[in-house]
């Protein structure tokens, strides 16, 4: 029975060229997290954090993605093409799979509002 809930940073915006933290948090469950997957809007994998093996950043994102903080992900050198949905998928035992959604809007530097709670200045 899946009792947990995923909390995310929700809808966030950040400056072109800047950085942003994507963060999900699983609560209200005793389940043990065995792996967290981070996917982009086109379902391409950015990174995986496996409990035993640690972080794996996919080659296409190696230069612009940094693991953490925690189970989150830091996106750097943002471009307008980074605008879109991001998904965290928590694989947990014995509950199964939890999924969270974040929408990132990358704005031209002159109009960006610092709306992200976890955003890096």
């Amino acid at each position: 029975m899946m009792t947990g809930t995923i909390e995310t940073t929700g809808n966030i915006s950040a400056k072109k060229g800047g950085s942003v933290i994507l963060q999900c948090h699983l609560s209200s469950t005793m389940a043990q997290v065995t792996q967290v997957n981070w996917e982009q809007h086109d379902h391409s994998l950015l990174a995986i954090r496996n409990a035993e093996l640690g972080w794996h950043i996919y080659p296409a994102f190696k230069d612009r993605v940094a693991p953490g903080p925690g189970l989150g992900l830091t996106l750097q050198s943002l471009t307008m093409n980074d605008t879109g949905e991001y998904f965290c998928t928590y694989h947990t035992y014995p509950d199964g799979t939890y999924r969270g959604r974040i929408f990132l809007e990358v704005l031209e530097s002159s109009v960006a509002e610092h709306s992200a709670r976890f955003q890096i200045p």
Epitope: M30, A31, T34, Y93, P94
Partner: antibody, heavy 121, light 106 residues
Framework: EVQLVQSGSELKKPGASVKVSCKAS????????MNWVRQAPGQGLEWMGW????????TYAQGFTGRFVFSLDTSVSTAYLQISSLKAEDTAVYYC??????????????WGQGTLVTVSS | DIRLTQSPSFLSASVGDRVTITCRAS??????LAWYQQKPGKAPKFLIY???TLQSGVPSRFSGSGSGTEFTLTISSLQPEDFATYYC????????FGQGTRLEIK
């Protein structure tokens, strides 16, 4: 080599308590949930529940609440099962089994060699 | 709770035979099913996960199939070391084991 080594057989009187240990080696103890499984003489396998090796939080399956306690000592990579107020029907082989995983799929591997607990007056 | 029913409960076969064990779930469990082999006095041995994925080191004569509510474990050509009890296990909604299938030499 990944392995689980359990403590030896126990002969106990009704009303007594027993503590079974399960020492893990060959892997990161806190990266994998640990389960306990009971097998009464001539019977099948019965999942007793599991313990989150990150948090120490135990979860008990139906029929295994009250007299059964799962615990950990992460400093020595060991899980414990304690049964109090033993009854004749607690006579069984008790196994610890690590949860293995790949993405959203889970299984039990490896298993400890089993500990026979005999309750007799 | 999801119940797993294995059939048959007892099976007599000869070396070289092809045998199939069925495991039925009381409700759909997708492919969240594992198979184990247990010999007398020994701990269970893990064989298959995700209904059909063979664990490394398990002989290729073992295979699993199915999804939803009906699953099978097939041994294509029985070897002497295969005579044992086999259990299915669902990992979709907490965990339960089937009652076991005892495979004996005819």
């Amino acid at each position: 080599e990944v392995q689980l080594v359990q403590s030896g057989s126990e002969l106990k009187k009704p009303g007594a308590s027993v503590k079974v240990s399960c020492k893990a080696s060959g892997y990161t103890f806190t990266s994998y949930p640990m389960n306990w499984v009971r097998q009464a003489p001539g019977q099948g396998l019965e999942w007793m529940g599991w313990i989150n090796t990150n948090t120490g939080n135990p979860t008990y399956a139906q029929g295994f609440t009250g007299r059964f306690v799962f615990s950990l000592d992460t400093s020595v990579s060991t899980a414990y099962l304690q049964i109090s107020s033993l009854k004749a029907e607690d006579t069984a082989v008790y196994y610890c089994a690590r949860t293995g995983y790949s993405g959203s799929y889970y299984w039990f591997d490896p298993w400890g060699q089993g500990t026979l607990v005999t309750v007799s007056s | 709770d999801i119940r797993l029913t294995q059939s048959p409960s007892f099976l007599s076969a000869s070396v070289g035979d092809r045998v199939t064990i069925t495991c039925r779930a009381s409700q759909g469990i997708s492919s969240y099913l594992a198979w184990y082999q247990q010999k007398p006095g020994k701990a269970p041995k893990f064989l298959i996960y995700a209904a059909s994925t063979l664990q490394s080191g398990v002989p290729s004569r073992f295979s699993g199939s199915g999804s939803g509510t009906e699953f099978t474990l097939t041994i294509s050509s029985l070897q002497p070391e295969d005579f044992a009890t086999y259990y299915c296990q669902q990992l979709n909604s907490y965990l339960t084991f089937g009652q076991g299938t005892r495979l004996e030499i005819k």
